[in-house]
């Protein structure tokens, strides 16, 4: 059963950052498309997390394609070593908080929250249930806790981390985003199954996040939410990346990962591990 | 005092077009949403869309995105609604509700707008 | 989008006794986006319970919401004659929002 083809590995806190993505688009595979010309295109790669180049093939393919290296890091890079305790200590927000509202491409309408830069406060916004950007927050609280100004002079950042004006201490802080040992994966891997509105009985997989196994599910053909995968592979890597502990104060951090690179599923939540 | 004062009744035939208007006044009319719900006699309500003044995001129930037509005013603090294509089951009650940008509570309902459109 | 279906279509019931007003959603509603309003002949709704359990300024402590995922419920632990009215859930989960048809609650 794949569900058991799992190896723990022991991942220091300096060697994996969390991936964050500027545009979703940057998760996307390289796409040569399906016509022949030979292009020296540069595509980011969300496993090695680089710029690296491909073949293009001249027509069609996706977002994650640019004309050259520097493009492509401007794009879906970031400076992620150190970068919440930097733009804490800065008391900066995030870069996607600037971000406009982004319903992206899908229809399974929602209620998300962003941060609105011209009335500096977050507010409910109708989310298509797929890609879009970073500046999408399930609850109101998270919204706040990540983009808005704390009080007394307070950025919070988005690990649940405040920095104390007086003493700048950096103190714990309880909110309702992911704390920094824990591994929260896709937001949607914790939705029940939804069958959807259409008539349709396909054969596909959601997480139960009680259980933590992906089990089978009918869905109806249209609408429904994202916790639906066609397999029950593509359920487990998209969910079941394990849960992250802390094992010392040391900070090393036992995970569970699959063995093979496997393409996970294209989402700006995808956020692996979080580390300081 | 928030108030949301709505337009006359209206008498239209099928076909047609009809114009509502919601004046606001007691707050800031551009930080809020206004919203649009309808009410056939006896029947439940229908939410329509929301329009939040400021930038001019538009949401519209699906069902009504062909035929109403959201806008506001910001200078007279007033939202419009506009439904072409009039047809008998257009008939209901039309009224106006605000809601803050964060939740959905629409706290505070215009008095509502009959239109009735019959040949 | 949501179909929320209330039940019953009219409960009669006399003052003193208590009301219980079923919603129930075709797909699982966050609490938080789950709204009751209460309307009275004549008059536009009003907003009375809000993220299930909060009751909204000047509602009686007698009201009570309860409730998650598909089923919700409002309570009236004893009816005083100013509670019969139409009550209607109302979802903001999923776009369109909804509202459930409506329970009346009328004086037997």
């Known amino acids: 059963d794949s569900e058991e083809d799992e190896e723990h590995t022991i991942i220091t806190d300096t060697e994996l950052p969390p991936l964050k993505l500027m545009h979703s688009f940057c998760a996307f595979k390289a796409d040569d498309g399906p016509c022949k010309a030979i292009m020296k295109r540069f595509f980011f790669n969300i496993f090695t997390r680089q710029c690296e180049e491909f073949i293009y093939g001249g027509c069609e393919g996706n977002q994650n394609r640019f004309e050259s290296l520097e493009e492509c890091k401007k794009m879906c890079t970031r400076d992620n070593a150190n970068r919440i305790i930097k733009t804490t200590l800065q008391q900066e927000k995030p870069d996607f908080c600037f971000l406009e509202e982004d319903p992206g491409i899908c229809r399974g309408y929602i209620t998300r929250y962003f941060y609105n830069n011209q009335t500096k406060q977050c507010e409910r916004f109708k989310y298509g249930g797929c890609l879009g950007n970073m500046n999408n927050f399930e609850t109101l609280e998270e919204c706040k806790n990540i983009c808005e100004d704390g009080p007394n002079g307070f950025q919070v950042d988005n690990y649940g981390t405040q920095l104390n004006a007086v003493n700048n201490s950096l103190t714990p802080q309880s909110t309702k985003v992911p704390s920094l040992f824990e591994f929260h994966g896709p937001s949607w891997c914790l939705t029940p199954a939804d069958r959807g509105l259409c008539r349709a009985n396909e054969n596909r997989f959601y997480y139960n996040s009680v259980i933590g196994k992906c089990r089978p599910f009918k869905y109806s053909g249209c609408g429904g939410n994202e916790n639906n995968f066609t397999s029950k592979q593509e359920c487990l890597r998209a969910c079941k990346k394990g849960f992250i502990q802390r094992i010392s104060k040391g900070g090393l951090i036992k995970t569970k990962r699959k063995r093979k690179k496997q393409r996970v599923k294209i989402a700006y939540e995808e956020i692996f591990v979080k580390n300081m | 005092e928030v108030q949301l004062v709505q337009s006359g009744a209206e008498l239209k035939k099928p076909g047609a077009s009809v114009k509502l208007s919601c004046k606001a006044s007691?707050?800031?009319?551009?930080?809020?949403?206004m919203h649009w719900v309808r009410q056939a006699p006896g029947q439940g309500l229908e939410w329509i869309g929301e329009?939040?003044?400021?930038?001019?995001?538009?949401n519209y129930n699906e069902k009504f995105k062909t035929r109403a037509t959201l806008t506001a005013d910001k200078s007279t603090s007033t939202a419009y609604m506009e439904l072409s294509s009039l047809r008998s089951e257009d008939t209901a009650v039309y009224y106006c509700?605000?809601?803050?940008?964060?939740?959905?509570?629409?706290?505070?309902w215009g008095q509502g707008t009959t239109v009735t459109v019959s040949s | 989008e949501i179909v929320l279906t209330q039940s019953p279509a009219t409960l009669s019931l006399s003052p003193g006794e208590r009301a219980t007003l079923s919603c129930s959603a075709s797909s699982s509603v966050s609490s938080s986006y789950l709204y009751w309003y209460q309307q009275k002949p004549g008059q536009a709704p009003r907003l009375w319970i809000s993220g299930t359990s909060i009751l909204a300024s000047g509602v009686p402590a007698r009201f009570s919401g309860s409730g998650s995922g598909t089923k919700y419920t409002l309570t009236i632990s004893s009816l005083e004659p100013e509670d019969f009215a139409v009550y209607f859930c109302h979802q903001w989960s999923h776009y369109p929002f909804t509202f459930g048809q409506g329970t009346k609650l009328e004086i037997k």
């Open positions: 329009i939040k003044p400021d930038q001019g995001r538009i």
């Open positions: 007691g707050y800031t009319f551009t930080s809020y949403w």
């Open positions: 509700a605000r809601s803050s940008v964060v939740d959905e509570a629409m706290d505070y």
